[in-house]
Interface confidence: medium
């Protein structure tokens, strides 16, 4: 009869290297009498006999993992016990080896020039794969802008047009190499104007061609704006070459205007625009306008609140340090002077002063004030305020006038554009349209001008009837 013998593990467990999805086997050879019970643990947790991922054979001495997963790595131990002496244990490690696998491949990217692009490339593998990138057919070299991150992703700072192309990432370890599919990096470029239209000073009735050239990716479209509105007349010719669009606007000039070229291209849901503007002025009366520098904005003051259209843009002259405030003070001072004038003259003079100091304005790169129509200026000077105007001019010539209208550059009517030449080139004074209908007798006028110069105001039309936007009192 055999003598009882405590278990002895004759072949201790060793480290096992295994590839994912392959078989891994641990052998735990035991000598003992009687035959021992052998149990297995992974990371100190008992492996159940009925777990279908494992096969336990040879009386428990052979543990086989049927299809290794990357989560199987750890410390495996066999424990042998037959009741004689103590239980014995031997442990070994399972190192799951894995060919490189790209778990988050790069995707096609559209990026705006100058921004940062990141192409993902997340990998798995044991040993940890190294990641490199290929652009086109060549290995990509890292530099101050281009770096492969710890995660494997490719980061490109300040993306340039030349970064566009096809990219793939490569994951490599001792067991193999994995390649991502080719992805495309498209670099989009904001619309930019290469050649701005030039300003022109021309005679009435001339033809002018304004040219505007823009570049961008995708190729921009060009539209033209005249004094804030879509161009209503003129012909446009366009050509595109090498992502450059060339647009030419031909105009027949009957009024001065601010022409803006707008280049637009689309980036996803957003648009980028670039603008450039040119003025077309008419030589006959350009000087008084050309010297003005300023901006267009809503009138926020009080003095002219009842006279100016409520939502109109007016011109503020930046030759003053604080144009809004300076012009408000000027008009306020002049307003006080008007307290002494006749009831016929005062509202007409107020309308003239407010519309002269706060001229209607076309916004743009070069904001353009719109002067009062000559006929309306003459109506105030020679109909409504004839006596007052003569008195003021007399005082001014003798150096006696130091405030009010004299402080304000009252318009020189003869230098203003005529509404008969172009009704859209100057500002009307609706107050006068309204009053003209209501005045039955005008004061007799002593004028050095021929009577033909006395304005022939147009009959009131619906656009100049009493409107809530204007005060007629």
């Amino acid at each position: 009869e055999k003598l009882p013998k405590a278990p002895v593990i004759t072949t201790p467990l060793e480290t096992v290297d295994a590839l994912v999805e392959e078989v891994a086997t641990f052998m735990c050879a035991v000598e003992s009498y009687p035959q021992p019970e052998i149990s297995w643990t992974r990371n100190k947790i008992l492996i159940k006999l009925f777990d279908t991922r494992y096969s336990i054979r040879e009386n428990g001495q052979l543990l086989t993992i049927l299809s290794v997963e990357d989560s199987d790595d750890g410390i495996y131990c066999c424990i042998a016990n037959n009741g004689v002496g103590g239980a014995v244990e031997s442990c070994g490690a399972l190192q799951v080896k894995m060919k490189p696998k790209i778990t988050r491949p790069p995707i096609n990217v559209k990026i705006i020039e100058g921004l940062k692009a990141v192409l993902p490339c997340t990998t798995m593998g044991n040993p940890k794969p190294s990641v490199s990138w290929i652009k086109g057919d060549n290995a990509l070299r890292e530099n101050s802008r281009i770096a492969v991150l710890e995660s494997g992703s490719l980061r490109i700072h300040n993306v340039q047009k030349e970064d566009a192309g096809q990219y793939r990432c490569v994951a490599k370890n001792s067991l193999g190499t994995a390649y991502s599919k080719l992805v495309k990096l498209e670099v989009e470029v904001f619309a930019r104007i290469l050649r701005a239209p030039e300003s022109h000073n021309v005679t009435f009735g001339s033809f002018v061609t304004l040219r505007c050239t823009a570049i961008g990716i995708p190729v921009p479209t060009i539209s033209w704006i005249e004094n804030g509105n879509a161009v209503s007349s003129g012909s446009i010719q366009e050509s595109v070459k090498d992502r450059v669009i060339d647009s030419r606007l031909q105009l027949f000039i009957t009024k001065p205007g601010l022409y803006t070229c707008i280049a637009t291209n689309k980036h996803g849901e957003k648009f980028s625009t670039a603008k450039a503007a040119a003025t077309v002025s008419i030589a006959e009366w350009s000087k008084s306008q050309k010297d003005s520098q300023g901006y267009c904005a809503q009138y926020r003051g009080e003095v002219c609140d009842a006279v100016l259209a409520k939502d109109a843009l007016v011109f503020f002259n930046t030759s003053y340090r604080d144009p809004e405030d300076a012009q408000e003070l000027l008009i306020h001072t002049a307003w006080n002077e008007l307290k002494a004038v006749s009831p016929l003259c005062r509202p007409a003079a107020e309308a003239l002063l407010c519309n002269h100091l706060f001229q209607e304005c076309s916004p743009g790169v070069v904001p353009t004030p719109m002067p009062i129509c000559r006929e309306y200026c003459l109506a105030v000077k020679e109909l409504f305020c004839a006596k007052e105007w003569q008195a003021m001019e007399g005082k001014a010539h003798r150096g006696l006038y130091r405030s009010g209208m004299h402080l304000l550059p009252v318009p020189e009517c003869s230098k203003l554009p005529s509404m008969h030449r172009d009704p859209t080139a100057c500002t009307r004074l609706p107050y006068l349209d309204y009053k003209k209908e209501n005045i039955t007798t005008f004061p007799s006028i002593t004028s050095s001008r021929p009577s033909a110069d006395i304005p022939n105001l147009p009959a009131s039309t619906s656009s100049f009837a009493v409107s809530p936007a204007y005060s007629m009192t």
Partner: antibody, heavy 121, light 112 residues
Framework: EVQLLESGGGLVQPGGSLRLSCAAS????????MSWVRQAPGKGLEWVSA????????YYKESVKGRFTISRDNSKNTLYLQMNSLRAEDTAVYYC??????????????WGQGTLVTVSS | QTVVTQEPSFSVSPGGTVTLTCGLS?????????PDWYQQTPGQAPRTLIY???SRHSGVPDRFSGSILGNKAALTITGAQADDESDYYC????????????FGGGTKLTVL
């Protein structure tokens, strides 16, 4: 140095009245538009009313029109806000603020420290 | 009624650049809204930073600048500092039947 000092705040019952004053110094008061701005506890700024340099026009937030009256006394360098028919939602710190120029709607370029108005029963 | 919108909160690293915006629930902010920007630290009265779109108030460091970006007014702070951590409000002049001045809800800026 521009200084704006509010006074007149306090606790008042709903439906009651208060008159806030703002004493101005360090600038030519009559050359500047003025405003009242309020801030409810833990909330943002809310413009209440404005008045230009000469006080000829007055402007109000819609919810206070007919209940609040802004006025100024240029000889005393003082801005006022008369508040009638007060409601719980009028509870706030009321700031007096100087505008950057004569007009009523220039930028607010100097502020007082505020006076607290509490409307509660 | 048109509402003036601002980002409720924003964070920036010291030395970083941040752009706060001020828009309208309907329509665009233009220079005719004369956008102004104010800074307020808790328990203090507001302080004026920028007026009329891009004019810097006296004594305000040139790290603060104002502009119109697209359809919004913008306040840009470059080289952010710890004491820039504050609430920032924009104010817009509005005309819709009557003159009005409306503040945005404010942006809480955190300098991390």
């Amino acid at each position: 140095e521009v200084q704006l000092l509010e006074s007149g705040g306090g606790l008042v019952q709903p439906g009651g009245s208060l008159r806030l004053s703002c004493a101005a110094s360090g600038f030519t008061f009559s050359d500047y538009g003025m405003s009242w701005v309020r801030q409810a506890p833990g909330k943002g700024l809310e413009w209440v009313s404005a008045i230009p340099w000469q006080g000829g026009s007055t402007y109000y937030k819609e919810s206070v029109k007919g209940r609040f009256t802004i006025s100024r006394d240029n000889s005393k360098n003082t801005l006022y806000l008369q508040m009638n028919s007060l409601r719980a939602e009028d509870t706030a710190v009321y700031y007096c603020a100087k505008r950057s120029g004569r007009i009523a709607f220039g930028a607010l370029d100097a502020w007082g420290q505020g006076t607290l108005v509490t409307v509660s029963s | 009624q048109t509402v003036v919108t601002q980002e409720p909160s924003f964070s920036v690293s010291p030395g970083g650049t941040v752009t706060l915006t001020c828009g309208l629930s309907s329509g665009s902010v233009t220079s005719s809204n004369y956008p102004d920007w104010y800074q307020q630290t808790p328990g203090q009265a507001p302080r004026t930073l920028i007026y009329s779109t891009d004019s810097r108030h006296s004594g305000v460091p040139d790290r603060f600048s104002g502009s119109i970006l697209g359809n919004k007014a913008a306040l840009t702070i470059t080289g952010a500092q710890a004491d820039d951590e504050s609430d920032y409000y924009c104010g817009l002049y509005m005309y819709s039947g009557s003159k009005n001045y409306v503040f945005g809800g404010g942006t809480k800026l955190t300098v991390l």
